[in-house]
């Protein structure tokens, strides 16, 4: 009778609660990776940034993988991707090679199955950083919503890597899953 | 028989629908706070902005609290945080104190339990706003994914607050919960 | 007995799985629209951009509609809206009409029921693009969390449309639903 219904309902609810928590609330992939300043490339040409923290300070990762400088997707889905990149120069670091700079970020997706790399988002600015100012700073932010498949890799390319701000609040990128693929 | 199954299924589904709606679809915290222009500090030094609207125009808040100039977290979780800050100056407002400016935003997290403040995100640019142009404008956008605990507080610091654009579409910050903490 | 409980539980779980997938994981509206470069307006005045791709490359749409240059909301909810707009100029394209530019984006919401248009977000910068540099570039990113009702329309206005970067990774806007309205 009613006892049987209550027992079964508890059993169903319990299993559902487990399933819901597992499938939705706690298994949704995300990553927030912050720049590893001990290994920033020099120079002014466009380079891929391969050194990022994933487990210290604000950096964290769940149900995604960080390997060989790339953020690897483990779960198909639609993700919001973002990047914040800060550049700075102080006169005490010596003169810039040129006062006309192109400060750029490119968020790229690489597919292993079909070896190809494509830019998902780009942003930045040309800047004139004159010697009259003791300090220069500039930040770029990009973000967008993309379909990502398991095994695909996200990486960050920048121009002028030697000018990157090494603080964890300044130079970072990340992703979080919003939705399954239909 | 089948009637008993249908009745019980309806009962289970009903309770689950209520639970799901309550727990997921409608109880997810968020805030979108817009600048209160009646109380913007003067000067050029870095200050914390304490006057924001939470219930007029585009501004809104749910399952979070706005108090003493800070956005207070009421529910543990992973949140996407964002800020958009616009600066402007018109020659009719008089000369700038200096033509070399540092226009910056800092999104900070304060923990009451361990009284400490940390910058989660920063962005901005140094600018040369010469007297040759009648009008100057610059916007900063930052965003990122962070673990926030109940009781923690989010606040916004800017340089040159007297140059802030007071429009609700220009200067705002916000947060929305994406995911529970494992 | 236990067989009956298992059968009914499977039936309940099954229906719930369908409902959950339908209602949450796969029916959440989103759009990511990329600039259609074949139809960018000329000039430097503020214009509404009406030509966007919704089904090629990174562009995609689900449970929203793109019509007459506007992104139409089909489902009430709280959405995260974003835009990334890139401007560029190369000296080989001829001289700029003026070296002092205002490069801006406005994300607007139009309600059909009450014919009115309001700016949700704006961003940009005044720039001095001198003839001393062969190439100029600048990107704007804005994002925010807004309540949208079915039938409301999102559109993008920019200044200096002739300077827009036509790449899909450069000039785009989008939205994804985060939460139901209480």
């Amino acid at each position: 009778g009613s006892q049987h219904i209550r027992a079964e309902k508890a059993m169903v609810d319990g299993s559902w609660l487990d399933l819901a928590k597992r499938s939705k609330l706690e298994a949704q992939p995300f990553a927030h990776l912050t720049i590893n300043a001990t290994d920033i490339p020099s120079g002014s040409h466009k380079v891929s940034l391969s050194s990022w923290y994933h487990d210290r300070g604000w950096a964290k990762i769940s149900n995604m993988t960080f390997s060989n400088g790339k953020l690897i997707v483990n779960q198909d889905g639609f993700y919001y991707l973002y990047a914040n990149i800060c550049f700075r120069h102080h006169e005490t670091s010596g003169d810039l090679a040129t006062e006309y700079l192109q400060l750029m970020v490119y968020v790229t997706k690489t597919s292993i199955k079909i070896p190809s790399s494509h830019t998902l988002m780009k942003g930045g600015s040309t800047k004139y950083w004159s010697g009259n100012s003791e300090f220069h700073f500039y930040s770029i932010n990009v973000g967008g919503f993309f379909k990502l498949r398991s095994g695909e890799e996200i990486s960050i390319e920048v121009s002028n890597p030697s000018l990157l701000d090494p603080d964890q609040d300044a130079t970072y990128f990340g992703a979080f899953k919003v939705r399954d693929i239909d | 028989g089948s009637q008993h199954i249908r009745a019980e299924k309806a009962m289970v589904d009903g309770s689950w629908l209520d639970l799901a709606k309550r727990s997921k679809l409608e109880a997810q915290p968020f805030a979108h706070l817009t600048i209160n222009a009646t109380d913007i500090p003067s000067g050029s030094h870095k200050v914390s902005l304490s006057s924001w609207y939470h219930d007029r125009g585009w501004a809104k808040i749910s399952n979070m609290t706005f108090s003493n100039g800070k956005l207070i977290v009421n529910q543990d979780g992973f949140y996407y945080l964002y800020a958009n800050i616009c600066f402007r100056h018109h020659e009719t407002s008089g000369d700038l104190a200096t033509e070399y400016l540092q226009l910056m935003v800092y999104v900070t997290k304060t923990s009451i339990k361990i009284p400490s403040s940390h910058t989660l995100m920063k962005g901005g640019s140094t600018k040369y706003w010469s007297g040759n142009s009648e009008f100057h404008f610059y916007s900063i956008n930052v965003g990122g994914f962070f673990k926030l605990r109940s009781g923690e507080e989010i606040s916004i610091e800017v340089s040159n607050p007297s140059l802030l654009d007071p429009d609700q579409d220009a200067t705002y910050f916000g947060a929305f919960k994406v995911r529970d903490i494992d | 007995g236990s067989q009956h409980i298992r059968a009914e539980k499977a039936m309940v779980d099954g229906s719930w799985l369908d409902l959950a997938k339908r209602s949450k994981l796969e029916a959440q509206p989103f759009a990511h629209l990329t600039i259609n470069a074949t139809d960018i307006p000329s000039g430097s005045h503020k214009v509404s951009l009406s030509s966007w791709y919704h089904d090629r490359g990174w562009a995609k749409i689900s449970n929203m509609t793109f019509s007459n240059g506007k992104l139409i909301v089909n489902q009430d909810g709280f959405y995260y809206l974003y835009a990334n707009i890139c401007f560029r100029h190369h000296e080989t394209s001829g001289d700029l009409a003026t070296e002092y530019l205002q490069l801006m984006v406005y994300v607007t919401k139009t309600s059909i029921k009450i014919p009115s248009s309001h700016t949700l977000m704006k961003g940009g910068s005044t720039k001095y693009w001198s003839g001393n540099s062969e190439f100029h570039f600048y990107s704007i990113n804005v994002g925010g969390f807004f309540k949208l009702r079915s039938g409301e329309e999102i559109s993008i206005e920019v200044s200096n449309p002739s300077l827009l970067d036509p790449d899909q990774d450069a000039t785009y806007f989008g939205a994804f639903k985060v939460r139901d309205i209480d």
Epitope: H90, T92, S133, E134, F135 | Q102, S159 | -
Partner: nanobody, 120 residues
């Protein structure tokens, strides 16, 4: 806190020289660098040059390079601005300023200013 007091400003003929002094007192150990600024009549404040506390390195605005020199006397905690080949456009109120952090254009401490007038 750090206190700054400028002196040495006066009327001088074009082509002449002048030395301004800035006496620094208080928590001088917190200073990252010291700078001289000037504000001409009807103009915004502009940087003239800077000296770094750690190594006494100096940097100058293009408009004064080769004519102005910044130096420091550690014993008396005084910063100097030696101005040679003065021009009428150098007429301004000159301020010394100090700051405590590297990555900022905002100076934390300011003197009251001293007037320099260059007549033609």
């Amino acid at each position: 806190e750090v206190q700054l007091v400028e002196s040495g400003g006066k009327l001088v003929q074009a082509g002449g020289s002048l030395r301004l002094s800035c006496a620094v007192s208080g928590r001088t150990s917190s200073i990252y660098n010291m700078a001289w600024f000037r504000q001409g009549p009807g103009k915004g404040r502009e940087s003239v040059g800077r000296i770094y506390w750690s190594d006494d390195n100096t940097y100058y605005a293009d408009s004064v390079k080769g004519r102005f020199t910044i130096s420091r006397d550690n014993a008396t905690n005084t910063v100097y601005l030696q101005m040679n080949s003065l021009k009428p456009e150098d007429t301004a109120v000159y301020y010394c300023a100090g700051k405590t952090t590297k990555w900022s254009l905002e100076y934390d401490y300011w003197g009251q200013g001293t007037q320099v007038t260059v007549s033609s």
